[in-house]
């Protein structure tokens, strides 16, 4: 079982390989000096049907380096960064993992592209392994909370309350969604 030639890359090169390309072979992409690699640099020859070989993912791309590019902090609810730190410049990558009791959908790594957006795929999502969810928390008078969405919230996530200026927060500032589908505390109040 073998793979066909790896997908070509513009303004870059592919590591050495011999043919036929056996299943298990890794080829690596790199970019010329003034270009930045966007996407996974390694492709693996795999087989899904034990008959034909195929590459396990699309080839990355080489973008002309944009020194002015800068990407915003990427947020994955239920997840956290295991690699990457601000500032995020063109070609920088961030890798995510999911918190306990969350499973990942999508690709764990994204790259800062020349257009100031993360890619080449969308940010991953971390999905609760528990079917239970906590009901949406109410807004409070003279205050706000971080979760502006009206939908329910997965266990492991939290909501942070704050008060408008001149008001004092009474109660818990941070309320966690428990695996039972219940909130860890009642919403606080904002008092003068």
């Amino acid at each position: 079982i073998s793979c066909g030639s790896p997908p070509p890359i513009l303004n870059g090169r592919i590591s050495y390989y011999s043919t036929p390309i056996a299943v298990g072979t890794v080829i690596r992409y790199s970019c010329s000096g003034t270009f930045r690699l966007i996407g996974e640099k390694s492709l693996l020859c795999i087989t899904k049907d034990k008959v034909d070989g195929t590459w396990d993912k699309p080839a990355p791309k080489c973008e002309y380096f944009n020194k002015y590019s800068s990407c915003p902090e990427p947020i994955v609810p239920g997840g956290y960064k295991i690699r990457g730190s601000t500032p995020y410049r063109h070609g920088d990558s961030v890798t995510f993992a999911c918190k306990t009791n969350f499973s990942m959908n999508g690709n764990k790594s994204v790259w800062c592209q020349a257009n100031n957006m993360w890619g080449p795929t969308r940010l991953p999502t971390c999905v609760s392994v528990f079917p239970l969810e906590c009901p949406a928390l109410p807004m409070i008078h003279n205050g706000h909370h971080t979760s502006e969405n009206v939908g329910s919230i997965a266990p492991g996530l939290s909501v942070t309350y704050s008060c408008e200026s001149g008001y004092l927060l009474v109660g818990e500032k941070i309320i966690n969604c428990l695996s039972s589908g219940k909130w860890s505390a009642v919403p606080p109040t904002c008092e003068e």
Epitope: G24, R28, L44
Partner: antibody
């Protein structure tokens, strides 16, 4: 960090076979690659082959082709290396090593297993 | 097979001084090179990957450079714990190691 724990030292006769195990804990065993690297006494490191458990297919260095078999048991997160037709030159410490995401370099190593081939 | 050649075989340096180890590839390997440190009776430890990126927890005194066929590992100010054997490894095409450089106290 992933921990790799190897089986104990072995003494073997020429012409026989040896099977060394490498149990992984931490991380997702099936998605990373396990290589076997050996080191003869006072010598350098020599790559023998590797397996990606999720694929179940192993690749071998030409020198060891036909004499080494690398397998993996996903249910126990254990990789195995079997070397047959042993000769005195196979006396070495055998290491298992882990590479993540087909990175090509080894972040984690087992403690090593000394295999002595002697009549 | 891509042949990796390290030099010198043995390097004698005093603590606090700078050590420079070389590794040459038989053909271009881009930046697909790693450096490892090995102490007697221990498994190798990853120091540098992609020719110049320090692995997690590796002190800043270790640095790697080079691309193509010529690579260098530099230890800026040698500590007593740095005296060991150092190996380079290519991963451009499968995997091969250099024969090692023994770094000893002068």
């Amino acid at each position: 960090q992933v921990q790799l724990v190897q089986s104990g030292a072995e003494v073997k006769k020429p012409g026989s076979s040896v099977k060394v195990s490498c149990k992984a804990s931490g991380g997702t065993f099936s998605t990373y690659a396990i290589s076997w690297v050996r080191q003869a006494p006072g010598q350098g490191l020599e790559w023998m082959g590797r397996i990606i458990p999720i694929l179940g297919i192993a690749n071998y260095a030409q020198k060891f082709q036909g004499r080494v078999t690398i397998t993996a048991d996903k249910s126990t997160s254990t990789a195995y290396m079997e070397l047959s037709s042993l000769r005195s030159e196979d006396t070495a410490v055998y290491y298992c090593a882990r590479e993540d995401d087909s990175s090509g370099y080894y972040q984690d190593w087992g403690q090593g297993t000394l295999v002595t081939v002697s009549s | 097979e891509i042949v990796m050649t390290q030099s010198p075989a043995t390097l004698s340096v005093s603590p606090g001084e700078r050590a420079t180890l070389s590794c040459r590839a038989g053909q271009s390997i881009n930046s697909y090179l790693a450096w490892y440190q090995q102490k007697p009776g221990q498994a190798p430890r990853l120091l540098i990957y992609d020719a110049s990126t320090r692995a997690t927890g590796i002190p800043a005194r270790f640095s790697g450079s080079g691309s193509g066929t010529e690579f260098t590992l530099t230890i800026s100010s040698l500590q007593s714990e740095d005296f060991a054997v150092y190996y380079c490894q290519q991963y451009e095409y499968w995997y091969t190691f250099g024969q090692g450089t023994k770094l000893e106290i002068k």
